[in-house]
């Protein structure tokens, strides 16, 4: 297993609709054709794998398990979007990238993106 640098933004604020997007960029030492991206959430004394996708370079990412994630890839960048977030989902979201094929296997883990989620205030009742 060889180490690889992964960069991601330090902080992202989710939209009022509970959507957060960030870029996960990895310094690929070679020409990988198969890449696996996993997003992990670290909070509340748990580490949770939020979503994972394996993709062939040039193809779109496919996530399993009713995923709350969507994503696209462009070169060594993965644009990740996490949906359906609530205030309780605030936490550190870590991007993990694995270059699966061809060998050698490379692994890179980012420092994490702190995603802040603020639940929208309910609209006051209107007489109009």
């Amino acid at each position: 297993c060889k180490a690889m640098h992964v960069a991601q933004p330090a902080v992202v604020l989710a939209s009022s609709r509970g959507i957060a997007s960030f870029v996960c960029e990895y310094a690929s030492p070679g020409k990988a054709t198969e890449v696996r991206v996993t997003v992990l959430r670290q909070a509340d004394s748990q580490v949770t794998e939020v979503c994972a996708a394996t993709y062939m370079m040039g193809n779109e990412l496919t996530f399993l398990d009713d995923s709350i994630c969507t994503g696209t890839s462009s070169g060594n960048q993965v644009n990740l979007t996490i949906q359906g977030l609530r205030a309780m989902d605030t936490g550190l979201y870590i991007c993990k990238v694995e270059l699966m094929y061809p060998p050698p296997y490379y692994l890179g883990i980012g420092n994490g993106t702190q995603i802040y989620v603020i639940d929208p205030e309910p609209c006051p009742d209107s007489d109009f």
Epitope: R41, D44, T48, C51, A52, D65, D66
Partner: nanobody, 126 residues
Framework: EVQLVESEGGLVQPGGSLRLSCSAS????????MGWFRQAPGKEREFVAS????????SSADSVKGRFTISRDNAKNTVYLQMNSLKPEDTALYYC???????????????????WGQGTQVTVSS
């Protein structure tokens, strides 16, 4: 309704290992995340680990990270909890539970789970 039946626990020495299994019958097992929780005497039920419907995603409590591994076999309708390097503080009643979804960010909360096993006692003592 889903029936969840845990394997027998037991008495294990500190540093020892034990594998729990949980068999499910009823609704389609492969559609739902599964989890393990535990409850020590006089304490609240706490999250241990969970695994997504397809088995690709997992979540675990910091207290068991690196020691406990959750896995599942959808062909056998069974979820497993491999417990290594057991400590006296792991002593508890262990419950298997079925999540109402394939996966979510709230898999560590008890309210996400609809069906529960009866529990199996694990005691770690010399």
């Amino acid at each position: 309704e889903v029936q969840l039946v845990e394997s027998e626990g037991g008495l294990v020495q500190p540093g020892g290992s034990l594998r729990l299994s949980c068999s499910a019958s009823g609704r389609t097992f492969a559609n739902n995340a599964m989890g393990w929780f535990r409850q020590a005497p006089g304490k609240e039920r706490e999250f241990v680990a969970s695994i997504s419907a397809s088995g690709t995603l997992t979540s675990s409590a910091d207290s068991v990270k690196g020691r406990f591994t959750i896995s599942r076999d959808n062909a056998k309708n069974t979820v497993y909890l491999q417990m290594n390097s057991l400590k006296p503080e792991d002593t508890a009643l262990y419950y298997c539970a079925r999540n109402r979804r394939a996966w979510s960010l709230s898999v560590h909360t008890t309210r996400e789970y609809d069906d529960w096993g009866q529990g199996t006692q694990v005691t770690v003592s010399s």
